[in-house]
């Protein structure tokens, strides 16, 4: 099985024990590590931060002692914006220039492939996204002719039904991608006005339309029905939780909220907590399991957080095995307890290790 793990370059800027550089990663933990994110500048792939090149080097040095590890560079992301991607993909010359710039950049910096993180193609971009993928793959095939190992091509796709329908021609893009990471998280957020888990495995008992689509099982099944081969589908598992501030004394699923949860000490983003911050939060918190959805949530005071733990990730891995998927994807290594100092197990990357162990179990 593949274990595809994202590393985010901005994690270097977190304070103190939250600061994560690629040399802190475990070279034997994942089969693939994807560096997020690269930029596109003047229609050429480019670093996002000036210092990225140093971090590329740190990451790719991990392969010195684990030659089986593959590294990919992810281009795009939330800050890049869909419009910029759209402009490049829809213009034949810009697209060509971009595609041509990719192999030398990846080779120079020691990457084994490219991950496309166009978040998200609009309805009018659907065909252009397909063309971009098809032409990128053709370039990779051509570039590998002189006996080089062919560069890998993957894409991170939304798990939301509405986005899947408008953005992707699943059957066509699947032909050209080496694997597809489906982002089966962020199904529920503060915009809903109530508490809810952002990455449930199954549909909740109360879930009516459109909530019945907002779970991992539905998203995976839908992708498969649309023509994604199970052998190329990698299922996303988050090492972060989504938090809310409760608006009343109600604390269960569906309780009213006044907004996102308070920012974490290190990640400093309202409504989001890294797993290592959740481990801190759990001291003195009340933990519940949403039985049907097979995921936990915890409450403390007026704070509510839905997250994944070692038990829930094992359930998710069992599920992906049952569906004969290609493996699991983790967002992100730097949000797991990468130092092993927060979650009291004296184990680095406890969630990702639990995923790895479950994938290896017979």
């Amino acid at each position: 099985y593949k274990l595809v793990c994202y590393y985010t370059s901005w994690s270097q800027y977190r304070e103190g024990d939250g600061s994560c550089f690629p040399d802190a990663l475990d070279r034997f933990l994942c089969t693939h590590i994807i560096y997020s994110f690269a930029n596109i500048s003047n229609d050429h792939i480019d670093t996002w931060e000036w210092n990225d090149v140093t971090l590329y080097g740190m990451l790719n040095t991990l392969k010195n002692r684990n030659p089986n590890l593959k590294t990919l560079l992810s281009v795009g992301g939330w800050n890049f914006g869909s419009q910029r991607f759209s402009k490049i993909a829809s213009n034949t010359q810009s697209r060509r220039t971009f595609i041509k710039s990719v192999p030398p950049f990846l080779r120079t910096h020691g990457f084994d492939g490219l991950d496309l993180a166009w978040l998200y193609p609009g309805r009018r971009d659907k065909q252009h996204f397909t063309t971009l993928i098809k032409e990128m793959k053709a370039e990779f095939i051509k570039e590998a002719q002189p006996g080089k190992k062919q560069l890998l091509l993957s894409a991170a796709l939304s798990a939301g039904k509405v986005t899947i329908d408008s953005s992707y021609d699943i059957a066509k893009i699947s032909q050209h991608l080496d694997f597809i990471s489906i982002m089966t998280y962020d199904f529920h957020g503060a915009w809903r006005g109530t508490t809810g888990h952002h990455s449930p495995l199954f549909r909740g008992q109360e879930d009516a339309s459109p909530d019945r689509f907002s779970n991992t099982d539905y998203a995976v099944g839908y992708m498969l029905r649309l023509g994604a081969p199970a052998s190329k589908l990698v299922m996303g598992i988050p090492t972060f939780g989504r938090s809310f501030t409760l608006a009343s004394s109600e604390t269960g699923v569906g309780a009213p909220i006044s907004g996102p949860g308070i920012p974490g000490r290190f990640t400093k983003e309202a409504g989001t907590l890294a797993y290592y911050e959740i481990c801190d939060f759990l001291r003195g918190a009340t933990v519940h399991r949403i039985l049907g959805q097979q995921v936990p949530y915890a409450t403390k005071g007026n704070q509510w957080v839905g997250y994944d733990d070692q038990e829930s990730v094992k359930s998710k891995v069992q599920y992906l095995k049952d569906r004969q998927l290609a493996g699991a994807m983790v967002w992100a290594l730097d949000l797991d307890d990468f130092q092993g100092s927060f979650c009291g197990q004296d184990l680095r990357f406890p969630l990702t290790n639990a995923i790895k162990d479950a994938l290896a179990a017979t």
Epitope: Q12, S41, N42, W50, N51, V53, T54, P104, T108
Partner: antibody
Framework: EVQLVESGGGLVQPGGSLRLSCAAS????????MSWVRQAPGKGLEWVSA????????YYADSVKGRFTISRDNSKNTLYLQMNSLRAEDTAVYYC??????????WGQGTLVTVSS | DIQMTQSPSSLSASVGDRVTITCRAS??????LNWYQQKPGKAPKLLIY???TLQSGVPSRFSGSGSGTDFTLTISSLQPEDFATYYC?????????FGQGTKVEIK
């Protein structure tokens, strides 16, 4: 083998202009940021300017902002520094440098710029 | 701008001595601190980057440590070829800035 060869230095009067060039070889030029660093006679190192591999972003020290312009021609593997409104305090050896992220991993041998009347 | 302050500005040492040079940043620069060696009439040479990573080909007697605002370059056993001027440089943010240098002389 990485090679960086600077040219264009010389004597110029205050208020004058000069254009430095740096011919690069031995690496994929367009994939790396480049920098200019200077060193006044008997003094320490001073970073002057930097440009990303794509040429899409440029950065300058406050002391040269608005007077110096860094540019590159990736098709010619050449880095440039256009220096206008030169002052006596710009007198220095100017090094062309290849950056590897935040660090400068290769340096040219430098070209001397003297600003004097 | 981030100010970089090196100490001492010069030191005298003998071959075989353990030498320590410190560099202090005016604000936190995480691990983005590099060290260079420069000999008279020559271009500088990168020794250590990102606080502690030894540049390829640099002898293991050189080491770096620190994080945040305080950093150290250590030469465990000074060799004749190590007599030179050493500079620290922050690459946390632009404009990049160098320390004023530390000259290591023969005692």
């Amino acid at each position: 083998e990485v090679q960086l060869v600077e040219s264009g230095g010389g004597l110029v009067q205050p208020g004058g202009s000069l254009r430095l060039s740096c011919a690069a070889s031995g690496f994929t030029f367009s994939s790396y940021g480049m920098s200019w660093v200077r060193q006044a006679p008997g003094k320490g190192l001073e970073w002057v300017s930097a440009i990303k591999g794509s040429g899409g972003s440029t950065y300058y020290a406050d002391s040269v902002k608005g007077r110096f312009t860094i540019s590159r021609d990736n098709s010619k593997n050449t880095l440039y520094l256009q220096m206008n409104s030169l002052r006596a305090e710009d007198t220095a050896v100017y090094y062309c440098a290849k950056t590897y992220g935040g660090e400068i991993d290769y340096w040219g041998q430098g070209t001397l710029v003297t600003v004097s009347s | 701008d981030i100010q970089m302050t090196q100490s001492p500005s010069s030191l005298s040492a003998s071959v075989g001595d353990r030498v320590t040079i410190t560099c202090r940043a005016s604000q936190s620069i995480s691990r983005w601190l590099n060290w260079y060696q420069q000999k008279p009439g020559k271009a500088p040479k990168l020794l250590i980057y990102a606080t502690s990573t030894l540049q390829s080909g640099v002898p293991s007697r050189f080491s770096g440590s620190g994080s945040g605002t305080d950093f150290t370059l250590t030469i465990s056993s000074l060799q004749p070829e190590d007599f030179a001027t050493y500079y620290c440089q922050q690459s946390y943010s632009f404009p990049w800035t160098f320390g004023q240098g530390t000259k290591v002389e023969i005692k």
